[in-house]
Interface confidence: low
């Protein structure tokens, strides 16, 4: 149910493109294509190409994206396009000028002097933005989200965007300055991963990050399963970067117990993050005993 045909406008197309990109990434990383038939991979790649081509129709002259061409461009959506295209670049041919143009727009047009990224064109499909939807601590969570996207695009865009390292550092400094006052476990997790990507998730931030986990295994807000899966996935990625393999098993066990395999309304971020995190876990911890995922992928019928 994760491999779907992308369709619709600038936001809906990304909602449709997300699960296919992350499913292929997951199956590639974990070398599980035999289970589903290696020929399915090519079909999935065709769907990703289709989503990529369709998304270009919503690229504005500034290289930013919005749901429709007559709407103001969205910081969050543009960062998300950067994130998905960066991952897809390992799978299909992505024009680096398209990807890095979006990166340049984020830095030059949307980053304030204090490092914060601002949103002037909120997405219409609020269900696609995951835990960021809760307006509390939005400056930090948006800045962390964009920072993560910039880091993921760094290998491809560093040569084309001179200001990229400086922008990343500025955003990181803002997150560092705000981190100890964060209240939401979601923000602690996403911002923690952003800091970990910069090798800055150390004391006192590390203590805050670890102490925010409920029972040492989840970054949880009441009655928010999708946000909690998303947040805990960010946290798992941070723990893996830290090589804190003592703290990893209970987190993986919790994610596994959720039996959450993506898909469904409002699941875009949870789907993307849980499969990114579990793929990374299975790569970094080859002798994994904590994961027994019964994942099923279905290709759409023609």
């Amino acid at each position: 149910h994760l491999i779907v045909t992308p369709a619709g406008a600038g936001e809906q197309n990304m909602i449709g493109m997300t699960p296919t990109v992350i499913a292929v990434h997951y199956l590639d990383q974990t070398e599980q294509w035999e289970k589903f038939g290696i020929e399915k991979r090519q079909e999935a790649l065709e769907l990703i190409k289709k989503g990529y081509t369709q998304q270009l129709a919503f690229k504005q002259p500034s290289s930013a994206y919005a749901a429709f061409n007559n709407r103001p461009p969205s910081t969050w959506l543009t960062a998300y396009v950067v994130k998905v295209f960066s991952l897809a670049a390992n799978l299909i041919a992505i024009d680096s000028h398209v990807l890095c143009g979006a990166v340049k727009w984020l830095i030059l047009e949307k980053q304030k002097p204090d490092g914060v990224f601002q949103e002037d064109g909120p997405v219409i499909h609020q269900e696609m933005i995951g835990g960021f939807r809760n307006a509390k601590e939005a400056d930090v969570s948006l800045t962390a989200f964009v920072l993560i996207a910039l880091q993921e695009a760094r290998d491809i865009c560093e040569g084309q965007v001179n200001s990229l390292p400086g922008s990343i550092n500025k955003a990181g400094e803002y997150i560092e300055a705000s981190y100890m006052n964060l209240q939401r476990p979601y923000t602690v997790a996403i911002a923690g991963y952003a800091l970990a990507l910069m090798n800055k998730l150390e004391e006192p931030y590390l203590g805050k990050f670890l102490n925010t986990a409920k029972d040492r295994n989840r970054w949880e807000e009441p009655d928010q399963q999708l946000y909690n899966v998303e947040a805990t996935s960010y946290a798992l990625l941070a723990l893996l970067l830290l090589k804190d393999f003592d703290s990893v098993p209970p987190v993986v066990r919790w994610l596994n117990e959720q039996r959450y395999y993506g898909g469904g309304y409002g699941s875009t971020q949870a789907t993307f993050m849980v499969f990114q995190a579990l793929a990374q876990y299975q790569t970094d911890v080859p002798d994994h005993k904590d994961l027994n995922m019964d994942v099923s992928f279905h290709l759409p019928s023609r």
């Epitope: 203590g207 102490n211 029972d215 040492r216 804190d244 003592d246 703290s247 098993p249």
Partner: antibody, heavy 120, light 108 residues
Framework: QSLEESGGRLVTPGTPLTLTCTVS????????LGWVRQAPGKGLEYIGW??????AYYASWAKGRFTISKASSTTVDLKMAGLTTEDTATYFC????????????????WGPGTLVTVSS | DPVLTQTPSSTSAAVGGTVTIKCQAS??????LAWYQQKPGQPPKLLIY???DLASGVPSRFKGSGSGTQFTLTISGVQREDAATYYC??????????FGGGTEVVVK
């Protein structure tokens, strides 16, 4: 920074009892607080702790019978129900070493303890 | 609950000597372990938190090490005032936490 426990006394089995930990020199709105007990001549036993927002966490054996709650920014109560002779001990409260989880950052300083004796 | 097995239950050392106390957890607790010192008639005192971080005001002769399931407290250059009982407190989660049985240190 100092802490003091109060409320310890001789009670009969089954009698509920509330102990209070009063802190001075800092506020519980930014610090955590833990409870530990020690039976006469025995080792230490962890009971639970409360965070700065008032959420309490308990050792699995203490769940249901013990309740930790914040009475004010300077006092925390430990309510004990269904007491038996096995609960005879000195009860200590201790501040989290920082505002974080005292099981991660340790507990320091400690109060002098208050003795609870359960006897028929 | 995690079981924390402290060894030895009692040990002695001459002034200036070295004492090593081990604490073994029955399950992986990462670095969630602290060491406490308790003298008769007194409350415990925090020595080490997060397995190896020295608490404020604690002399540097106290050293904590280890992670996962094996932890060690080493007192190098033992002083008379170090005569006490030492406890480890390990934590797998907020509800799964326990003290070790204690190690009595006698200084000769």
């Amino acid at each position: 920074q100092s802490l003091e426990e109060s409320g310890g006394r001789l009670v009969t089995p089954g009698t509920p009892l509330t102990l209070t930990c009063t802190v001075s020199g800092f506020s519980l709105s930014t610090y955590t607080l833990g409870w530990v007990r020690q039976a006469p001549g025995k080792g230490l036993e962890y009971i639970g702790w409360i965070d700065s927002s008032g959420s309490a966490y308990y050792a699995s054996w203490a769940k249901g019978r013990f309740t930790i709650s914040k009475a004010s920014s300077t006092t925390v109560d430990l309510k004990m129900a269904g007491l038996t002779t096995e609960d005879t001990a000195t009860y200590f409260c201790a501040s989290g070493n920082t505002g974080g989880d005292p099981l991660y950052y340790g507990m320091d300083p400690w109060g002098p303890g208050t003795l609870v004796t359960v006897s028929s | 609950d995690p079981v924390l097995t402290q060894t030895p239950s009692s040990t002695s050392a001459a002034v200036g000597g070295t004492v090593t106390i081990k604490c073994q957890a029955s399950q992986n607790i990462g670095r969630w372990l602290a060491w406490y010192q308790q003298k008769p008639g007194q409350p415990p005192k925090l020595l080490i938190y997060r397995a190896s971080d020295l608490a404020s005001g604690v002399p540097s002769r106290f050293k904590g090490s280890g992670s996962g399931t094996q932890f060690t407290l080493t007192i190098s250059g033992v002083q008379r005032e170090d005569a006490a009982t030492y406890y480890c407190l390990g934590s797998y989660s907020s509800s799964d936490s326990a003290f070790g049985g204690g190690t009595e240190v006698v200084v000769k």
